[in-house]
């Protein structure tokens, strides 16, 4: 079970006291606050494409737009990993790849992006409205997960645009260290503005939820991805879910990994050939889970809160534990 809880949400000041002029003077602090909260937040893009040649074949591509060193990638369908989603593949940068039917081939494309080809017929074949999710675990920064699916009207051979849907799940030290400094700066800025203008600053509304798993709701980096946050995760077409995950296809790990710098600080870009502007695909959503840094499929810890920057790595799953062939 994934415990979700609301964390201090940024609340605008109540209208009426200051009038329109007061609101205008608060635009700058809000912009600054938005920048403060979203600064440096990595993103995950997800792209789903149905192959024109085989209508039951899908290609999922996912990438991590961040500077951290990726420690694990989990691809699932039917929802986020650990929230009813079923694991299709787990890719470890050193130890290899495990995959489950109907995954045909999972592979590393670059040090920060992966691709997965799905095929199938019958019970284990994907269908057009299936949601696919990718979770990138980057230590110690945390885990980011994004989900996407084909637009309902997609023609075969066309792809949905990449879905940038950032989720941050980090250990407390990291998140409080970096975000704390940013938040302190923002609060200090507000304090100065308040002293200067003699007007009340926006309040931080404390959450009324379990202290076990606080969640920070931040400003989305774009209107598009903010809209995606408000799309509820509704239904899963169960006929598209796999009947069994016992079969697997062997696949080796990335042979190039050793030759690439493991600690390189870089910001990889999504492949331009697939899409020029990463905007959310229709029906995409973001989900969040509590807990400190966790690997794919590991249940959230039972102690200590985690902070996540966007509403929504081993919780309940369709199978008891991912097991595949490397």
């Amino acid at each position: 079970m994934r415990t979700e809880a609301q964390v201090p949400a940024l609340q605008p000041p109540e209208p009426g006291l200051e009038g329109a002029m007061g609101h205008r003077t608060l635009v700058l602090p809000w912009v600054l606050l938005t920048l403060c909260v979203t600064a440096g937040t990595p993103e995950v893009w997800v792209q789903v494409r149905m192959e024109a040649t085989e209508l039951s074949s899908f290609t999922i591509r996912c990438g991590f737009l961040g500077s951290g060193s990726i420690s694990l990638v989990t691809v699932s369908w039917g929802g986020p990993n650990g929230a009813g989603g079923t694991t299709l593949a787990v890719l470890h940068p050193e130890r290899g790849i495990r995959q489950w039917a109907p995954a045909r081939q999972a592979r590393w494309e670059t040090q920060s992006s992966i691709s997965l080809i799905l095929e199938g017929s019958g019970a284990s074949s994907p269908c057009a409205n299936t949601t696919f999710c990718c979770k990138f675990a980057s230590f110690p920064e945390g885990s980011w997960e994004a989900c996407g699916s084909l637009p309902p009207s997609s023609d075969p051979g066309l792809s949905a645009p990449p879905t940038p849907a950032p989720i941050l799940r980090a250990d407390l030290a990291g998140i409080l260290g970096v975000s704390g400094v940013l938040l302190f700066g923002c609060v200090y800025l507000l304090h100065l503005l308040r002293r200067h203008k003699h007007r009340p600053a926006p309040r931080l509304q404390p959450s009324r939820t379990s202290p076990q798993a606080p969640r920070a709701r931040a400003w989305a980096p774009s209107q598009a991805s903010q809209a995606a946050l408000h799309v509820p995760y509704a239904t899963i077409n169960t006929s598209c879910r796999p009947a069994t995950l016992d079969t697997a296809h062997p696949h080796g790990g990335p042979s190039w990994w050793a030759s690439l710098p493991t600690h390189a600080a870089h910001r990889p870009q999504g492949p331009a050939a697939w899409a020029s502007t990463p905007i959310p695909a229709r029906g995409s959503f973001v989900s969040v889970e509590n807990g400190l840094y966790a690997q794919a499929g590991e249940r959230p810890p039972h102690t200590g809160p985690g902070l996540t920057l966007f509403p929504d790595p081993r919780g309940p799953r369709a199978m008891e534990g991912p097991l595949g062939v490397r």
């Epitope: 420690s71 989990t74 050193e94 400190l292 840094y293 008891e320 534990g321 097991l323 062939v325």
Partner: antibody, heavy 119, light 107 residues
Framework: QVQLQQSGAELVKPGASVKLSCKAS????????MYWLKQRPGQGLEWIGE????????KFNEKFKSKATLTVDKSSSTAYMQLSSLTSEDSAVYYC????????????WGQGTSVTDSS | DIQMIQSPSSMFASLGDRVSLSCRAS??????LDWYQQKPGGTIKLLIY???ILNFGVPSRFSGSGSGSDYSLTISSLESEDFADYYC?????????FGAGTKLELK
């Protein structure tokens, strides 16, 4: 509840072989890799290798490649490790343990099987 | 192979003490580090996985932290059942390797 029950202690002659067993219960046997580890008296733990019970694929520590053979019997949810050409260096306690999730931690352990050189 | 250096190799402590055990890897292991407890009878139990995640059923006095190649296990207030051997395991790369262990004894 999840349990890994290992076979009893073995007293073996140098040069002989021994087959240790680990019977799993309380979970879907084919859904979790099984690992084998070695612990010599008063020493730390060494990873011998792992097996995918779903299809029998194995991965070994180079050090144990010619020493250990890992197999499974899905019908009885049992994992086996055969040790060959035994020497006094092989006298140790051997543990089977289950991988929690893909590439994850070892969350359930057998009680261990002691293998002793009879010479 | 990745070497795991645990320190101290043994330590004496009293009930209620706060203790920290250290584990250093010969190279970065991306947080793929677990802590295990072995009781005198030989029983082995997973305490912490992926650096800081408390395994189900493990008391909250146990906590883990670290990054890169340096990791630690902390017991906030020692209880009688905590006196045992503790091992760290890196599972970032093959072969998986354990530290030599820390023996925690009652002072």
């Amino acid at each position: 509840q999840v349990q890994l029950q290992q076979s009893g202690a073995e007293l073996v002659k140098p040069g002989a072989s021994v087959k240790l067993s680990c019977k799993a219960s309380g979970y879907t046997f084919t859904s979790h890799y099984m690992y084998w580890l070695k612990q010599r008296p008063g020493q730390g733990l060494e990873w011998i290798g792992e097996i995918n019970p779903s299809n029998g694929d194995t991965k070994f520590n180079e050090k144990f490649k010619s020493k250990a053979t890992l197999t499974v019997d899905k019908s009885s949810s049992t994992a086996y490790m055969q040790l060959s050409s035994l020497t006094s260096e092989d006298s140790a306690v051997y543990y089977c343990t289950r991988e929690k999730d893909a590439f994850s931690a070892l969350d359930y352990w057998g009680q261990g099987t002691s293998v002793t050189d009879s010479s | 192979d990745i070497q795991m250096i645990q320190s101290p190799s043994s330590m004496f402590a009293s009930l209620g003490d706060r203790v920290s055990l250290s584990c250093r890897a010969s190279q970065g292991i991306r947080g793929h580090l677990d802590w295990y407890q072995q009781k005198p009878g030989g029983t082995i139990k997973l305490l912490i996985y992926s650096t800081s995640i408390l395994n189900f059923g493990v008391p909250s006095r146990f906590s883990g932290s670290g990054s890169g190649s340096d990791y630690s296990l902390t017991i906030s207030s020692l209880e009688s059942e905590d006196f045992a051997d503790y091992y760290c395991l890196q599972r970032n790369a093959y072969p998986l390797t354990f530290g030599a262990g820390t023996k925690l004894e009652l002072k």
